[in-house]
């Protein structure tokens, strides 16, 4: 806390400006009213003041507003924005989407913190959903974003926002995040042609069910070995070796380099060897000729 | 994190000159103004001169027309360049750093202007 003094003679501030500077932490408390602050908020930022400074400016704002900021001033927070608590936070009532540009604008480059992870959530949950124009913006300061909200939290991504999603967006979604995602972009874009929906889709396949891997084998969409490798493992394995070399096309070739990891190691488990003999790989460890598959699933479910 | 080192300080006759170096190390892309402050013997440190990322300078009146605060970005150093130096200019001589999302401070130098 800074001691309350009285204002030397001649050094009131009239307005927010350079000369604050080289204003001693004390001089600002004492000489500078926080409505005139809160009105000249946006000068704030083109001023370099110490982030010591920032302290003392933050604490005459939260004097001011002690029920928490209005977007007015929020809007204009700048660096100021690095010395709030996600408590402070909390009290903020954010709707613009310009005022959380502005204070994302102010963390860019460097990894979400727990005020920029607060105010986000204070900003979508004040929306209602996830829509697309604040996934667009979210995206593009954090290319991990999406990946870093759980199942439930995804769940209120409309379909429409899909479109604002790039592949690097979903590099660290884990399968349940992608099981969430796939059925909106399947959604998304279901009016596309299949060479354009499978370029959109792709990055989305590590929640594809069984029967949609079926339909893409018809499609001559040639998926690479990285997006296959990321299917889910208990949609791969009921593939055909004949559906798998349509899904992959040229790239079947690929799966030998694969043949110790999943999915691809389980999914040769699962094929009559002289199958995978077709292919021409030397792949091995599939079932010997003449063994008779028991599906044990399908028995327990019938049972 | 922002490592600074500030050399040059030293004894002076008043009138003399001397330039301070500060060497700015670590994560300096985050930097966003440096500065040179000062503390006399028994008082508050105080700020001396301000200098931008894009190159605009701040002075207190008590140096004006006297100090010049300039950067290499090539050598990642701040200088001050410190001239008709007086009796007062005596304290130690602080470089800072204003980055994301703190305030980083060098050691000091002292600078004795003294006949």
């Known amino acids: 806390e800074v001691e309350k003094t009285a204002c030397p003679s001649g050094k009131k501030a009239r307005e927010i400006d350079e000369s604050l500077i080289f204003y001693k932490k004390w001089e600002l408390e004492a000489c500078v009213d926080a409505a005139l602050l809160a009105t000249q908020m946006d000068r704030v930022n083109a001023i370099p003041f110490t982030y010591e400074q920032l302290d003392v400016l933050k604490h005459k704002l939260d004097e001011l507003y002690p029920q928490g900021y209005p977007e007015s001033v929020i809007q204009h927070l700048g660096y100021l924005f690095l010395k709030m608590s996600p408590e402070d936070i909390r009290k903020w009532n954010v709707t613009s989407l310009e005022t959380l540009k502005a204070l994302l604008e102010v963390n860019k480059g460097h990894e979400m913190s727990p005020q920029v992870a607060t105010l986000i959530d204070r900003f979508v949950k004040g929306r209602g959903q996830l829509d697309k124009d604040t996934l667009d913006t979210l995206t593009a300061f954090y290319p991990g974003y999406l990946c870093s909200l759980s199942p439930e939290e995804l769940s209120s991504v409309p379909p429409s926002s899909i479109w604002a999603v790039r592949p690097q967006d979903l590099d660290t979604c884990d399968p349940r995040q992608l099981d969430v995602l796939y059925p909106k972009a399947r959604l998304a874009f279901q009016n596309m042609n299949g060479s354009e929906y499978f370029v959109k889709i792709q990055s989305f396949l590590g929640g594809a069910p069984t029967e949609d891997l079926k339909a893409l084998s018809q499609q001559n969409v040639s998926m690479d070995l990285a997006t296959f490798m990321k299917l889910r493992t208990d949609a791969v394995l009921p593939l055909t070796v004949a559906e798998v070399q349509k899904l992959l096309g040229p790239h079947v070739e690929g799966l030998k380099a694969e043949e110790r990891h999943r999915p691809v190691r389980d999914w040769i488990l699962r094929q009559r060897q002289d199958d995978l003999d077709t292919l021409g790989l030397g792949l091995q460890g599939g079932i010997p000729n003449g063994y008779l598959v028991l599906d044990l699933s399908m028995q327990e479910a019938l049972s | 994190e922002v490592q600074l080192v500030e050399s040059g300080g030293g004894l002076i006759q008043p009138g003399g000159s001397l330039r301070l170096s500060c060497a700015a190390s670590g994560n300096i892309g985050s930097i966003r103004h440096m500065g040179w402050h000062r503390q006399a013997p028994g008082k508050g440190r105080e700020l001396v001169s301000t200098i931008t990322t894009v190159g605009t300078t701040y002075y207190a009146n008590f140096v004006k027309g006297r100090f010049t605060i300039s950067r290499d970005n090539s050598k990642n150093t701040l200088y001050l360049q410190m001239n008709s130096l007086r009796a007062e200019d005596t304290a130690v001589y602080y470089c800072?750093?204003?980055?994301?999302?703190?305030?980083?401070w060098g050691q000091g130098t002292l600078v004795t202007v003294s006949s």
């Open positions: 800072r750093a204003t980055a994301h999302p703190t305030d980083y």
